[in-house]
């Protein structure tokens, strides 16, 4: 991927306008369609004052292990969606746009050098363990997408392009 | 149910400093940050900060930087706005407000609300 | 910083339908949270999430948010809608709440 492609807001901006048009599709979170076991998903609440104070290796912890966290759940959701019968064809598209949009923005994380903390995580932070959630609809699933992108995605990679540009 | 119970109404001097208060009631007042927004005469709401009661972090609008210190007690679940230098033009009125997360979202949005207190800026 | 803009007012006859608008640029990028406030009285979310309502709000109330504006709706308008509507984001540029100037909704007749 080119070098800090991530850092054009439009990039995350049409990653995050796909996951919402995804959420959408899935007809609300109460009547929309479940899914047939539940799915583990990353907690994707921040608490702004104190992620603002983190460094922005500790924020590059969390983000990838919620973006690996994230692809699996996703992945797992596809696996049940083919073995169920008659899966609707527009919430096969947006879980293979979704699949696809996570790998895109997995490539353009490495090139800003967020995996490298999690190889080696700052010495003074053990990154705390993940807080997780559960989903059991798409609705629900899609929602921690959108969520995780305009929120922990969004905020530390607008850190990390600030940092690059000085 | 939460309660937010505000100082009352306070006159001050231009150049002097006031401090509001908001109290907490129901549900733990640690779990969630207080936001303050202003409201002067026939105006819209304007954030002026906030405070998470758990790390003791404030943050401020520039607007405000270096002019209002927002702190937090939690012996009594109270959380406490300063504003220094008053003039003319803080005449508003003051509202704390709790902010909670509601499923689904990924940032706390303000829940609750205070009746707000008058502050007049007169000489 | 990020700028919301609405309306300075709307009229509806009671029983109508309301639509209040909020623009920002990019607007569908971020979440819109509704606030509703009566004279005298401190603001009440109405509307968070772009579209959820908090439990108490009336069915009536309901939100969107694509192409450049977030919308608020209310339908079957009743005497006591009449209020201030008030929109809001979380600028995560400047890391501050912004409200929009707000609408006072006047309610006819």
């Known amino acids: 991927a080119p070098p800090r492609l991530i850092c054009d807001s439009r990039v995350l901006e049409r990653y995050i306008l796909e996951a919402k048009e995804a959420e959408n599709v899935t007809m609300g979170c109460a009547e929309g369609p479940r899914l047939s076991e539940n799915i583990t998903v990353p907690d994707t609440k921040v608490n702004f004052y104190a992620w603002k104070r983190m460094k922005v290796e500790e924020q590059a912890v969390e983000v990838w292990q919620g973006l690996s966290l994230l692809s699996e759940a996703i992945l797992q959701a596809q696996a049940l969606q083919a073995n169920s019968s008659q899966p609707p064809e527009s919430l096969q598209l947006h879980i293979d746009k979704a699949i696809s949009g996570l790998r895109s923005l997995t490539s353009l994380l490495r090139v800003l050098g967020a995996q490298k903390e999690l190889m080696s995580p700052p010495d003074a932070t053990q990154a705390a363990p993940l807080r997780t959630l559960t989903a059991d609809t798409f609705c629900k699933l899609f929602r921690v997408y959108s969520n995780f992108l305009r929120g922990k995605l969004k905020l530390y990679t607008g850190e990390a392009c600030r940092r690059g540009d000085r | 149910q939460v309660q937010l119970v505000q100082s009352g109404a306070e006159v001050k001097k231009p150049g002097s400093s006031v401090k509001v208060s908001c109290k907490a009631s129901?549900?733990?007042?640690?779990?969630?940050?207080i936001s303050w927004v202003r409201q002067a005469p026939g105006q819209g709401l304007e954030w002026m900060g906030g405070?998470?009661?758990?790390?003791?972090?404030?943050d401020y609008a520039q607007k405000f930087q270096g002019r209002v210190t927002i702190t937090a007690d939690e012996s009594t679940s109270t959380a406490y706005m300063e504003l220094s230098s008053l003039r003319s033009e803080d005449t508003a009125v003051y509202y704390c407000?709790?902010?909670?997360?509601?499923?689904?979202?990924?940032?706390?949005?303000?829940?609750?609300w205070g009746r707000g207190t008058l502050v007049t800026v007169s000489s | 910083s990020y700028v919301l803009t609405q309306p300075p007012s709307v009229s509806v006859a009671p029983g109508k339908t309301a639509r209040i608008t909020c623009s920002g640029d990019n607007i569908p990028e971020y979440y819109v949270h509704w606030y509703q406030q009566k004279p005298g009285q401190a603001p009440v979310l109405v509307i968070y999430?772009?579209?959820e309502r908090p439990s108490g709000i009336p069915e009536r109330f309901s939100g969107s948010n694509s192409g450049n504006t977030a919308t608020l709706t209310i339908s079957r308008v009743e005497a006591g809608d009449e209020a201030d509507y008030y929109c809001?984001?979380?600028?995560?540029?400047?890391?501050?709440?912004?409200f929009g100037g707000g609408t006072k909704l006047t309610v006819l007749g």
């Open positions: 999430r772009d579209n």
């Open positions: 129901g549900g733990t007042f640690r779990s969630y940050a």
């Open positions: 809001q984001v979380f600028d995560e540029s400047s890391w501050h709440w912004v």
């Open positions: 405070i998470d009661p758990i790390s003791g972090f404030a």
């Open positions: 407000a709790r902010e909670l997360y509601y499923p689904g979202t990924w940032m706390a949005v303000m829940a609750y």
